[in-house]
């Protein structure tokens, strides 16, 4: 069984995540807290990184410019990152593009993807 200190660390990590992902603020039973936090946090950070990269790659977000940038966004960085990025883009490319075109912030886009929103029930 994990020590109380371990859960304290997990909660501290969760509070850090909340700063960029406020919907992580809900807290559930100790047993599934850390796993879910790590899982949500990882997907959410991947999303933020990709969206921020895409924003830097285009002067003005349009369907055309973001679509073009999306084909190159995973090409930079380590091969493991490229795999994670490509997997994310396969699932969410169209929606990320729509969010960017509409002028949503990276945080809004990643939250709208429900990457950090447990829609019902505890974490």
């Amino acid at each position: 069984r994990l020590s109380p200190e371990y859960y304290d660390l997990a909660r501290a990590h969760l509070r850090d995540e909340e700063k960029s992902c406020p919907c992580l603020a809900q807290e559930g039973p100790q047993g599934d807290l850390l796993t879910k936090t790590q899982e949500l946090g990882r997907d959410y950070r991947t999303c933020l990184t990709i969206v921020q990269k895409l924003k830097k790659m285009v002067d003005k977000p349009t369907q055309r410019s973001v679509s073009n940038a999306a084909t190159r966004v995973c090409a930079t960085g380590a091969s493991r990152w490229a795999d994670v990025c490509a997997n994310f883009m396969r699932r969410y490319q169209s929606r990320v593009t729509q969010g960017l075109v509409a002028g949503e912030t990276a945080q809004q886009i990643c939250e709208d993807l429900r990457l950090c929103i447990p829609s019902t029930g505890p974490l």
Epitope: K60, T62, Q63, R64, S65, S67, Q93, S94, R95, T97, Q98, G99, A102, G103, E104, T105, Q108, D112
Partner: antibody, heavy 123, light 111 residues
Framework: QVKLQQSGAEQARPGASVKMSCKAS????????MHWVKQRPGQGLEWIGF????????DYNQKFKARTTLTADKSSTTAYIQLSSLTSEDSAVYYC????????????????WGQGTTVTVSS | DIELTQSPASLAVSLGQRATISCRAS??????????MHWYQQKPGQPPKLLIY???NLESGIPARFSGSGSGTDFTLNIHPVEEEDAATYYC?????????FGGGTKLELK
């Protein structure tokens, strides 16, 4: 039901400014961007730009950027367009129209339009 | 800017016949296998009304006699059979590039 109610006709002198409003009801204001379109008498349609009420992001057609300001007030679910340094070329009907941020919110196009506000510029 | 050229500028069609309106874009308006081209109908003194979105999707409440097709740079709006209430001006519009642009319009009259 969805309604975009625009303010009444405006009469203005050359060089003056006008501010028109578009009151949205019947849907979640922050899930749609608000676009503005100009139509001169007997002419076609010209896209002016849009505002995202959620993030405050604006995108303008370069042709209108210098003298146009788009704003939105989330609390009153109202979008505004201000035209400054008016000339006779600004005499037209101005429409507001909503456009979903994400395609799963509705048809990915300008699906509802206001009735239009007529602006007449003359000395 | 992406220029949209509509043809014809006007057409007269008999009741029950087919009306075909073309819209050609100066460059492709496709991405992710989708075409970002839309069609609107406008009657005098009224705002435009969405008929077709993303090239071929019929807007809710629009009669099935309206249909859209095409991809890339060439798009078509078909109305069949034409009814009296279809007399109006029709516009295509793209949301692929910035700024969004409209075609010059096609005025449909009944013979």
């Amino acid at each position: 039901q969805v309604k975009l109610q625009q303010s009444g006709a405006e009469q203005a002198r050359p060089g003056a400014s006008v501010k028109m409003s578009c009151k949205a009801s019947g849907y979640t204001f922050t899930k749609y961007t608000m676009h503005w379109v100009k139509q001169r008498p007997g002419q076609g349609l010209e896209w002016i730009g849009f505002i995202n009420p959620n993030s405050g992001y604006t995108d303008y057609n370069q042709k209108f950027k210098a003298r146009t300001t788009l704003t939105a007030d989330k609390s009153s679910t109202t979008a505004y367009i201000q035209l400054s340094s008016l000339t006779s070329e600004d005499s037209a009907v101005y429409y507001c129209a909503r456009y979903p941020i994400y395609s799963d919110y509705g048809p990915y196009a300008m699906d509802y339009w206001g009735q239009g506000t007529t602006v007449t510029v003359s000395s | 800017d992406i220029e949209l050229t509509q043809s014809p500028a006007s057409l007269a069609v008999s009741l029950g016949q087919r009306a075909t309106i073309s819209c050609r874009a100066s460059e492709s308006v496709d991405s992710y296998g989708d075409s970002f081209m839309h069609w609107y109908q406008q009657k005098p003194g009224q705002p435009p009304k969405l008929l077709i979105y993303r090239a071929s999707n019929l807007e809710s409440g629009i009669p099935a006699r309206f249909s859209g097709s095409g991809s890339g740079t060439d798009f078509t709006l078909n109305i069949h059979p034409v009814e009296e209430e279809d007399a109006a001006t029709y516009y295509c519009q793209q949301s692929h590039g910035d700024p969004y642009t409209f075609g010059g319009g096609t005025k449909l009259e009944l013979k």
